[in-house]
């Protein structure tokens, strides 16, 4: 029961916090203008990974996409770079988890066949959250560099007569979305290979024993004859056709997932 | 085409409050915000507000943050700007602007302070 | 508050001729996310709302007869009406669109000579 709450709420956390990787990286707010010196702006600008945009007086809002690859800066490809291995690895974990549901029956799949699908989709939930969580930092990073780099040489104009305030980024709500989406994507991968211990078939101290008859040479394993017998790695008395049965593990109801917001 | 009415002409005296509407129509009242600007007989355009007719969020000039009061009515596409306080010196045209470069104008509402 | 200071005051030109109106700002105008200038030129003819003619200092609104072009960037712009036709008689305001208080030039009145 433990193991099948611990692997469901994993993969749930895990699909919440991609949905916010994916949200993140789509977002136009990486960066929004530091309104600090300048708190009377009518001209509001903020950036993403693929645009920048502009929210003019009127409440008009242009964005203009980066249209250019090779003349970005290159820590901005990383990041970009980052967040999408992130997605792509949460998305296939997301598969692989999927199959590996301890509530969920596929055909005739082992415990070992899960627990192993379980520890892959764990890991690849925290390679991806870690992928998210890395590049958020280095765009944070970026942005803290350029921000007391501009506030080096805020004020320029002709003889100081008049003054032309530099614009100035500060972390925008997407950094905070993604900080958050690739923590929840950490904790549920942790949470899939912390399940893939209990799901691992227990091992037994029966080992096999091969018995010779005169003229055959077959080789009987204890456990061989599932449905009825004791032995082997079917140590919980599980029905290996599925005809409807369920053990109590998997009569529990699972939790509806809610809505992240 | 954007097209903004207002209120008709008010007469009021000194010390009293005048509201003056501006429905909206011709484009999404949400997507713009709604500027007021007055302009004293003879003279130039002065800036009062805005409102955020989505939100009801306001940005007012400064001098008259504390007399003016901007609301929206979004089911009648509707903005009001109520001027308290009055003063001779508030005679003026009031005009609402919106839509991207303040492109569209109201034709103008003659508010007279006169004791 | 960013102030706008038009010159002339007035202005008087032949028809056919050349029109020219300056428009100088106490801060720059820039906007560097865009590189846009936010700087808004209106028209406005008596008894009758301002009329947009020009944003962004030199981007024509459509509608907006040809003769008519912005230019300038940070503090300094101008609104040129190459050829003066009689329907272009009216007050000439130059508007900061970059920064609240919205503020408006104190107007140029231009007339037939």
């Known amino acids: 029961m433990a193991v099948t709450a611990c692997q469901g709420l994993g993969f749930v956390v895990s699909l919440i916090g991609i949905a916010g990787i994916i949200a993140a990286t789509c977002m136009d707010q990486w960066s929004t203008q530091d309104l600090y010196n300048n708190p009377v702006t009518a001209v509001f600008n903020y950036q993403g990974l693929w645009r920048s945009c502009v929210r003019e007086s009127s409440g008009f809002t242009e964005c203009r996409g980066y249209f250019t690859l090779l003349g970005l800066p290159a820590m901005l490809q990383a990041v970009r770079a980052l967040m999408i291995v992130g997605i792509v690895l949460g998305a296939i974990g997301l598969l692989v988890s999927i199959f590996a549901l301890k509530c969920i029956r596929i055909g005739s799949m082992e415990d070992s066949a899960k627990a192993n699908m379980t520890l892959t989709s764990g890991i690849m939930f925290i390679v991806s959250g870690l992928c998210a969580i890395a590049g958020v930092s280095v765009f944070a990073n970026m942005l803290v560099t350029n921000f007391w780099m501009s506030t080096a040489n805020m004020y320029t104009g002709m003889g100081g007569m008049v003054q032309t305030v530099q614009t100035r980024y500060t972390f925008g709500a997407a950094l905070f979305v993604g900080w958050v989406a690739g923590g929840l994507t950490l904790i549920g991968g942790v949470m899939m290979c912390i399940a893939c211990r209990g799901l691992a078939p227990e091992e037994t101290n029966y080992k096999a024993v091969s018995y010779h008859a005169s003229g055959h040479s077959v080789a009987y394993k204890p456990g061989g004859f599932k449905a009825s017998t004791g032995f082997g790695s079917n140590t919980k008395n599980k029905k290996i056709y599925d005809g409807g049965a369920r053990t109590e593990d998997e009569v529990q109801s699972y939790p509806s997932k809610h809505d992240y917001v | 085409q954007v097209q903004l009415v207002q209120s008709g002409a008010e007469v009021k005296k000194p010390g009293a409050s005048v509201k003056v509407s501006c429905k909206a129509s011709?484009?999404?009242?949400?997507?713009?915000?709604m500027h007021w600007v007055r302009q004293a007989p003879g003279q130039g355009l002065e800036w009062m507000g805005l409102i955020d007719p989505s939100d009801s969020e306001t940005r007012l000039n400064q001098k008259f943050k504390d007399r003016v009061t901007m609301t929206v009515d979004t089911s009648t596409s509707t903005v009001y700007m109520e001027l308290s306080s009055l003063r001779s010196e508030d005679t003026a045209v009031y005009y609402c602007?919106?839509?991207?470069?303040?492109?569209?104008w109201g034709q103008g509402t003659l508010v007279t302070v006169s004791s | 508050d960013i102030v706008m200071t038009q010159s002339p005051d007035s202005l008087a030109v032949s028809l056919g001729e050349r029109a020219t109106i300056n428009c100088k700002s106490s801060q720059s105008l820039l906007n560097s996310g865009n590189q846009k200038n936010y700087l808004t030129w209106y028209q406005q003819k008596p008894g009758q709302p301002p009329k947009l003619l020009i944003y962004w200092a030199s981007t024509r609104e459509s509608g907006v007869p040809d003769r008519f072009s912005g230019s300038g960037s940070g503090t300094d712009f101008t609104l040129t009406i190459s050829s003066l036709q009689a329907e272009d008689v009216a007050v000439y305001y130059c508007q900061n669109d970059y920064s609240y208080p919205l503020t408006f030039g104190q107007g140029t009145k231009l007339e037939i000579k």
């Open positions: 011709g484009y999404s009242f949400t997507t713009y915000w």
């Open positions: 602007a919106s839509n991207r470069w303040l492109l569209g």
